[in-house]
C-alpha cells in the first residue's frame, strides 16, 4: 500500500503566439480544478479503459478574473498535493493523466458550467520511494509544470512497496490467532547503498551496488539526460568513436516533430507520434480532440463545426455543458401541470397528477363528475381539479355509498342525547337546556333572554335538527 | 468476453416489414451507444444510425429515416431495427455494433455477425 | 455528407509485403478517422482508432497516419491472416460514412 502524490507548480499560457490570455477570457470569473487519472502499464492505454490504479480530483483553486491589458499570468491554483492511495504493488510502469478543468462562475442557468481545458497523457516509469519527478508538458496552447511521486506507507517498503517490515521496537510475533497477510521482513533494514556515485536525483536502486535511472536519464550513474547522451551530436555514415553507432542523416533528423511528439522513419518519409491534445502530421495542431475522450455521461465526439473548436460533445437527454458533465435537473423547469408531482427516471421524465388531471405533464382536466354519479340522492360538486358528492342528509363517504351514523359525532350538547332520525338526527336536551343541538340554556343567569319557543315546543322538548 | 448476437437470415415479402435483433452480452448495456449498418452484396459498409439504450435517444440517417426505426428492450440488453415498406433495394447484410461511447469515443469497437435480409415474392 | 476515397481499389501483395493504404476525404475530418478490417464472410473488426491510436488486440504491425483529409494505414510485413477488405470510416460529422474499400489479396 502506499500514496501517489502529485504537485501542480503551475498552469498558464504555454510560450508562442496565440497563446490564450486566460481561462476565463470573455466569460467572467472563473477557477480551476485538476483530475489525476492513474493507469497501470506502458502499453497504449484505450481512453475508455479506466483508472485502474486510483484517481484524484483537487479542491477549487481561488476565483480568478482577467484583468484587460495586464501581462498573462500563470493562473491561481487550488492549495496542496493530489494524493492517489493504491492499496496493491505500485506497478512502477503506469500512464498519468492530468486533466485541467474550468469551473466558470458567471451568471449560469443550471449552476456553474464546468469544461475541460487540457489534458495531458504520459507514460512513466517511477520506482516508489524515490524522488520527486518533476515535469513540463504542452497541452494545446496551455503549459502545466509538476512534480510527483509514490511513496509506501509503512509497513510497507521496496520500490512496488510489497514487501511488509516489523520495526525494531515491535514484537516478533503475531498475536494470539493472527498471522502474517504476506511475508514480514524480521526489521526494517535500512535501503540498499547504491552504486558509489549513482545520482541521489536520477537515480535508484533495488539491489546494493545498482543504479537504476529514472525516465529521461541514462548512464552509469545516471547523470546524462537522455536527449544529450554523447551518441548524439555526430554525423557521417556511421561513428564507432564513442561505442556508439550512429546513422547518417534520416527524415527524423532535428525531429520535425513539435510539440513534443515523438518521430519514427518510415520508408522514405517519417511518421509523428503526437502527444495527446495535438494532432497533424508534424503534430503542428493544437488542442483537446474526439481523440483525447472529452465527452462523459454517454456524450458522442464528433469534430466541431468551425476550425476553433476542436470537438463537440452531443449529450443525451439529461446532461449538458460542452463536455455533458452536467446533470440537467430536467425538474426544475417545472414540466408538470396543475400541481402534478415531476420525477426524473433518467431515462424519461413522468409526471405524477394529481386527482382530477391526467396526461404526460398532466395538462388534461378531467370532468370529474362524469360517470362518478353520487349515489342515494347526492348531488356531485366539481371544482380545483377534484369532484365532491354533497349527500343527502344520512349518508357520507366520497359517493354517498356509506350510511351516515349523524350521532357518531356526538352532537348534542351538555348531557343531550341524540337520536338518529330518518332525515337527520334529534336531540332530547337534558333539563334546563334546549335548541337544536341542546347549546343554549333555558335561563342563562336566571333571566330569558331567548325568544320565545316556536309554537308548539316546550322548552326541554326534543327538537328536530332541520 | 463483449459479444453482440444477431440471427443468420430472414426471408422477408416485398411491401412487408420485419424487426431485426441484436441481443448484447459482457458489458453494460445501457452505457453504449448501439449502432446499425448496412452492407449490400460487395459493396461497402452504410451507418443507418445508433440508439442510446438508458434514454432510447437516436441518431439517424436522412436517408434511412422513414426506413429504420431503432429501439431498445434494456430488461433483456437487446437492441432492435424496423424495417418496413421493404423492397429488393433493402436485401443486404445488416450489422449492429457497439460504439466505445466512453469518452466520447464514435468508434465501433465490437461488431455483430449481421443479418442477411432478402426481400424476395 | 464527407466522401471518403479509398485507393487502391485492389493491392496483391506477398506475405511478408509492407503496405500502405490510402483514405481522401472530401474535406477535413480532423483526426476523427478509423480503419476496420472485414474478411471474407465476417463482420468488421476495429483495427485503428482516431488516425494512429492502437486498438488492444490487434497486432502492432498495423498502424495509421496522417491528419485533415489524407490517412494512410500501414501493414509492416503482412501475413496471410491480413488478406481482406479494409474500410476507413469518419465520425467528424453526421452522416459517418465509410470508405468504399480496399481489398488486400495474395499475389
Known amino acids: 500500500a502506499g500514496v501517489f502524490e502529485l504537485q501542480i507548480h503551475s498552469f498558464g499560457p504555454g510560450p508562442g503566439p496565440g497563446a490564450p490570455r486566460s481561462p476565463c477570457s470573455a466569460r467572467g470569473p472563473c477557477r480551476l480544478f485538476f483530475r489525476v487519472c492513474l493507469k497501470p502499464g506502458l502499453s497504449e492505454e484505450a481512453a475508455e479503459s479506466p483508472c485502474a490504479l486510483g484517481a484524484a480530483l483537487s479542491a477549487r483553486g481561488p476565483v480568478y478574473t482577467e484583468q484587460p491589458e495586464a501581462p498573462a499570468p500563470d493562473l491561481p491554483l487550488p492549495n496542496g498535493l493530489l494524493q492517489v492511495p493504491f492499496r496493491d504493488a505500485w506497478p512502477g510502469t503506469f500512464s498519468l493523466i492530468i486533466e485541467t478543468w474550468r469551473e466558470e462562475l458567471g451568471d449560469q442557468i443550471g449552476g456553474p458550467a464546468w469544461s475541460l481545458l487540457a489534458r495531458v497523457t504520459r507514460r512513466r516509469r517511477l520506482a516508489a520511494g524515490g524522488p520527486w519527478a518533476r515535469d513540463i508538458q504542452r497541452a494545446g496552447a496551455w503549459e502545466l509544470r509538476f512534480s510527483y511521486r509514490a511513496r509506501c506507507e509503512l509497513p510497507a517498503v521496496g520500490t512496488a512497496c510489497t514487501r511488509l517490515c516489523r520495526p525494531r521496537s515491535a514484537p516478533s510475533r503475531c498475536g494470539p490467532g493472527l498471522r502474517p497477510c504476506a511475508p514480514l521482513e524480521d526489521e526494517c533494514e535500512a535501503p540498499p547503498v547504491c552504486r558509489a556515485g549513482c545520482s541521489l536525483e536520477h537515480g535508484f536502486c533495488e539491489q546494493p551496488g545498482e543504479c537504476r535511472c529514472l525516465e529521461g536519464w541514462t548512464g552509469p550513474l545516471c547523470m546524462v539526460p537522455v536527449s544529450t547522451s554523447s551518441c548524439l551530436g555526430l554525423r557521417g555514415p556511421s561513428s564507432t568513436t564513442t561505442g556508439c553507432l550512429v546513422p547518417g542523416p534520416g527524415p527524423c533528423d532535428g525531429n520535425p516533430c513539435a510539440n513534443g511528439g515523438s518521430c519514427s522513419e518510415t520508408p522514405g518519409s517519417f511518421e509523428c507520434t503526437c502527444p495527446r491534445g495535438f494532432y497533424g502530421l508534424r503534430c503542428e495542431v493544437s488542442g483537446v480532440t474526439c481523440a483525447d475522450g472529452p465527452c462523459f455521461n454517454g456524450g458522442l465526439c464528433v469534430g466541431g463545426a468551425d476550425p476553433d473548436s476542436a470537438y463537440i460533445c452531443h449529450c443525451p437527454p439529461g446532461f449538458q455543458g460542452s463536455n455533458c458533465e452536467k446533470r440537467v435537473d430536467r425538474c426544475s423547469l417545472q414540466p408538470c401541470r396543475n400541481g402534478g408531482l415531476c420525477l426524473d427516471l433518467g431515462h424519461a421524465l413522468r409526471c405524477r397528477c394529481r386527482a382530477g388531471f391526467a396526461g404526460p405533464r398532466c395538462e388534461h382536466d378531467l370532468d370529474d363528475c362524469a360517470g362518478r354519479a353520487c349515489a342515494n340522492g347526492g348531488t356531485c360538486v366539481e371544482g380545483g381539479g377534484a369532484h365532491r358528492c354533497s349527500c343527502a342528509l344520512g349518508f357520507g363517504g366520497r359517493n354517498c355509498r356509506e350510511r351516515a351514523d349523524p350521532c357518531a359525532a356526538r352532537p348534542c350538547a351538555h348531557g343531550g342525547r341524540c337520536y338518529a332520525h330518518f332525515s337527520g338526527l334529534v336531540c332530547a336536551c337534558a333539563p334546563g337546556y334546549m335548541g337544536a343541538r341542546c347549546e343554549f340554556p333555558v335561563h342563562p343567569d336566571g333571566v330569558s333572554a331567548l325568544p320565545a319557543a316556536p309554537p308548539g315546543l316546550r322548552p326541554g322538548d326534543p327538537q328536530r335538527y332541520l | 468476453q463483449v459479444q453482440l448476437q444477431q440471427p443468420g437470415a430472414e426471408l422477408v415479402k416485398p411491401g412487408t416489414s420485419v424487426k431485426l435483433s441484436c441481443k448484447a452480452s459482457?458489458?453494460?448495456?445501457?452505457?453504449?451507444?448501439i449502432t446499425w449498418v448496412k452492407q449490400r452484396p460487395g459493396q461497402g459498409l452504410e451507418w443507418i444510425g445508433d440508439?442510446?439504450?438508458?434514454?432510447?435517444?437516436?441518431n439517424n440517417n436522412e436517408k434511412f429515416r422513414n426506413k429504420a426505426t431503432l429501439t431498445v428492450d434494456t430488461s433483456s440488453s437487446t437492441a432492435y431495427m424496423q424495417l418496413s415498406s421493404l423492397t429488393s433495394e433493402d436485401s443486404a447484410v445488416y450489422f449492429c455494433?457497439?460504439?466505445?461511447?466512453?469518452?466520447?469515443?464514435?468508434?465501433?469497437?465490437?461488431w455483430g455477425q449481421g443479418t442477411s435480409v432478402t426481400v424476395s415474392s | 455528407d464527407i466522401v471518403l476515397t479509398q485507393s487502391p481499389v485492389t493491392l496483391s501483395v506477398t506475405p511478408g509485403d509492407s503496405v500502405s493504404l490510402s483514405c481522401r476525404a472530401s474535406?477535413?475530418?480532423?483526426?476523427?478517422l478509423h480503419w476496420y478490417q472485414q474478411k471474407s464472410h465476417e463482420s468488421p473488426r476495429l483495427l485503428i482508432k482516431?488516425?494512429?491510436q492502437s486498438i488492444s488486440g490487434i497486432p502492432s504491425r498495423f498502424s495509421g497516419s496522417g491528419s485533415g483529409t489524407d490517412f494512410t494505414l500501414s501493414i509492416n510485413s503482412v501475413e496471410t491472416e491480413d488478406f481482406g477488405v479494409y474500410f476507413c470510416?469518419?465520425?467528424?460529422?453526421?452522416?459517418?460514412?465509410f470508405g468504399a474499400g480496399t481489398k488486400l489479396e495474395l499475389k
Open positions: 455494433a457497439k460504439i466505445i461511447t466512453v469518452g466520447g469515443a464514435y468508434v465501433m469497437d465490437y
Open positions: 470510416q469518419q465520425s467528424n460529422s453526421w452522416p459517418l460514412t
Open positions: 459482457g458489458y453494460t448495456f445501457t452505457s453504449h451507444w
Open positions: 474535406q477535413s475530418v480532423r483526426n476523427n
Open positions: 440508439i442510446y439504450p438508458i434514454s432510447g435517444s437516436t
Open positions: 482516431y488516425v494512429s
